[in-house]
């Protein structure tokens, strides 16, 4: 873990992250709260919006077309991830060929989570980890062998489950609920400013 | 001032279909979250369906529904004229309450959108009755 200096305002040291946050004003649609102060790049926010973009290959459309509902969420789970300056207090370091740095037990409103799995249960996925075990031969994900397509509900059946599991515990669900100053949204209105920064300092004092 | 007139309900046999309306004006925000909440007898007040309006950075409107109507309640908005829809399919005798429409300027996601607690402006109620 980070020292307790290192906490509040900081980016991960990760694919395309930038060393420092800054503003970025051309940040693009979901990415666009973060422009006053992001970690991430315009052109990163930009791909951040496509299916299989350069920054990590991947196929959100593995099992048949996802839904815009359920994308939207993806989408803004990659702007959080790549922009966000908050995520401070649960950076990790790992040893990756790709990362020297990952987020673990980022605590998501519970609304935020609930809303995602909701929005994606008319969609399909073959897998609840998404980090590991693709078959990744074509130069991007796909199914592995013997790994069926089924709606999202089979895979995560509850909401915690999706939030938790999907990207191997960066997320976990908390009890806490928008607006609470206790938990990370992945939704907020910029114009009511970043109610992350909040959060960050919580436990950033927790922690200390 | 805010003001919200709900219309639309009525009775129907069980199976039937309805659509609620909620018309809105004074509403001084652009981004608002509606919801759709019913109480019926005895019972306490609970949230049906909610729509958040959104904008660019939400790809779009939110909506979130309780269990009991998955599947069977559609919740839209018509930006042009201020007005928030329930479009009510197989309707059951559980069903039967009166129906009221309410809005806030809070970003309003998942279970948020259904609790009563987060609205501040509320419509006076249509009577839906639902006859088995």
């Known amino acids: 873990a980070r020292p307790r200096t290192e906490l509040l305002n900081v980016c991960m040291d990760a694919k395309h992250h930038k060393e420092k946050p800054s503003p970025e004003d051309g940040l693009h649609k979901q990415c666009s709260p973060w422009k006053k102060n992001s970690c991430c790049f315009a052109n990163t926010s930009r791909e951040a919006h496509k299916d299989i973009s350069y920054l990590y290959r991947f196929n959100w459309n593995h099992c048949g077309s996802m839904t815009p509902a359920c994308k939207k969420h993806f989408i803004q789970d990659t702007c959080l991830y790549e922009c966000s300056p908050n995520l401070g207090p649960w950076i990790q370091e790992v040893n990756q060929s790709w990362r020297k740095e990952r987020i673990l037990h980022v605590p998501l409103c519970k609304e935020d989570c609930e809303q995602w799995w909701q929005d994606c249960r008319t969609s399909y996925t073959c897998k609840s980890n998404w980090h590991k075990g693709w078959n990744w031969t074509s130069g991007y994900n796909q199914c592995p062998e013997g790994a069926a397509c089924h709606p999202f509900h089979f895979y995560f059946p509850t909401s915690a489950a999706l939030c938790s599991e999907i990207w191997s515990h960066s997320y976990k669900v908390s009890n806490y609920s928008r607006g609470s100053g206790r938990c990370i949204q992945m939704w907020f209105d910029p114009a009511q400013g970043n109610p992350n920064e909040e959060v960050a300092r919580f436990y950033a004092r927790a922690m200390s | 001032q805010v003001q919200l007139v709900e219309s639309g309900g009525g009775s129907v046999q069980a199976g039937g279909s309805l659509r609620l309306s909620c018309a809105a004006s004074?509403?001084?925000?652009?981004?608002?979250?509606m919801g759709w909440f019913r109480q019926a007898p005895g019972k306490e007040r609970e949230g049906v369906a909610g729509?958040?309006?959104?904008?660019?950075?939400?790809?779009?409107?939110?909506?979130y529904y309780a269990d009991s109507v998955k599947g069977r309640f559609t919740i839209s908005q018509d930006n042009a004229r201020n007005t928030v829809y329930l479009q009510m399919n197989s309707l059951k005798p559980e069903d039967t309450a009166m129906y009221y429409c309410?809005?806030?300027?809070?970003?309003?996601?998942?279970?948020?959108?259904?609790?009563?607690?987060?609205?501040?402006?509320w419509g006076q109620g249509t009577q839906v009755t639902v006859s088995s």
């Open positions: 309410a809005a806030t300027p809070q970003f309003l996601i998942g279970s948020g959108l259904l609790r009563p607690d987060k609205y501040n402006s």
């Open positions: 004074g509403y001084p925000y652009h981004r608002v979250s």
């Open positions: 729509i958040y309006t959104g904008g660019l950075y939400t790809g779009g409107s939110m909506t």
